[in-house]
């Protein structure tokens, strides 16, 4: 059974992930982002189901394309380079989902824009955080 300290750690990691995802969303929605139109043409895969931490596998697999789409935006839109930002997210995701279980991600048939994709994972974080508090 999860201890209160492990629950607290999970909550803090989810809050960190949430902030990072929100920061990316704010950065790409920045009115000074000349590449937004281009970025919105990229189709991201969405999870069929995202209710547990193991489902973060679906986010992990889309982090590389996310980094490459973010590379289009001018770096001044973000506090960190996309590479560093995604690297940070990757570390959190790996810790949260755990590496001992091999979960095969199932994707929905419908793809999403970068904004829809980020909003979906922001909602996921908020939902899990609310169950922990």
């Amino acid at each position: 059974a999860p201890t209160s300290s492990s629950t607290k750690k999970t909550q803090l990691q989810l809050e960190h992930l949430l902030l990072d995802l929100q920061m990316i969303l704010n950065g790409i929605n920045n009115y000074k982002n000349p590449k937004l139109t281009r970025m919105l043409t990229f189709k991201f895969y969405m999870p069929k189901k995202a209710t547990e931490l193991k489902h973060l596998q679906c986010l992990e697999e889309e982090l590389k394309p996310l980094e490459e789409v973010l590379n289009l935006a001018q770096s001044k839109n973000f506090h960190l380079r996309p590479r560093d930002l995604i690297s940070n997210i990757n570390v959190i995701v790996l810790e949260l989902k755990g590496s001992e279980t091999t979960f095969m991600c199932e994707y929905a048939d419908e793809t999403a824009t970068i904004v829809e994709f980020l909003n979906r994972w922001i909602t996921f974080c908020q939902s899990i955080i609310s169950t922990l508090t």
């Epitope: 281009r38 043409t41 990229f42 189709k43 895969y45 697999e61 289009l72 095969m104 994707y107």
Partner: antibody
């Protein structure tokens, strides 16, 4: 890490067919298209066609239409390219490469040498 | 079908030189162009995508520019490992098409 591992070299007689495989690992196979590109010795790169592993949809360069077939087996994350009615000018290294929209071809197989000789 | 014309077809340069390779599309392709490096006996490697974006792991001396029909790949200061053949690839429409390649040789 992402890897595309292709089958070994083949020697074929003119008129025969060859089937090259490309096994993907390190990512979900159905999320990237598989493209096939060939290169004759000392020549440039020539795009042959693509396949979407999720839907099975394919598209071929006009030059290979009717002679090439691209298929996949999603259960083993493997793509296949079959070229029929082989002629000596089909002697080349055949590459598979994964691609996704405007990201280009980010990972390539090691290549498979197909030699057509009587 | 879109034709890609690369120039020059070969180029001699020295370590430390600044080198520019051009690719011209027969019709507008927006930013849908990538650059690839190939060394003898090896598979090509992606250097640039979407005309000017650098994938992680590619040295910053490589840069791409252009849109529409005219594109350039620039190597700001040639290193010994940069002597190879370079190809552009349009991924705007099917069939995809490569430029004929530029062989970069040591002077």
């Amino acid at each position: 890490q992402v890897q595309l591992v292709q089958s070994g070299a083949e020697v074929k007689k003119p008129g025969a067919s060859v089937k090259v495989s490309c096994k993907a690992s390190g990512y979900t196979f159905t999320t990237y298209d598989i493209n096939w590109v060939r290169q004759a010795t000392g020549q440039g790169l020539e795009w042959m066609g693509w396949m979407n592993p999720n839907s099975g949809n394919t598209g071929y360069a006009q030059k290979f239409q009717g002679r090439v077939t691209m298929t996949r087996n999603t259960s083993i994350s493997t793509a296949y390219m079959e070229l029929s009615s082989l002629r000596s000018e089909d002697t080349a290294v055949y590459y598979c490469a994964r691609g996704r929209q405007w990201l280009g071809f980010d990972y390539w197989g090691q290549g498979t040498l197909v030699t057509v000789s009587s | 079908d879109i034709q890609m014309t690369q120039s020059p077809s070969s180029l001699s340069a020295s370590v430390g030189d600044r080198v520019t390779i051009t690719c011209r599309a027969s019709q507008g392709i927006g930013d849908d162009l990538g650059w690839y490096q190939q060394k003898p006996g090896k598979a090509p490697q992606r250097l640039i995508y979407s005309a000017s974006s650098l994938p992680s792991g590619v040295p910053s001396r490589f840069s791409g520019s252009g849109s529409g029909t005219e594109f350039t790949l620039t190597i700001s200061s040639l290193q010994p490992e940069d002597f190879a053949t370079y190809y552009c690839l349009q991924h705007n429409s099917y069939p995809r098409s490569f430029g004929q390649g530029t062989k970069l040789e040591i002077r």
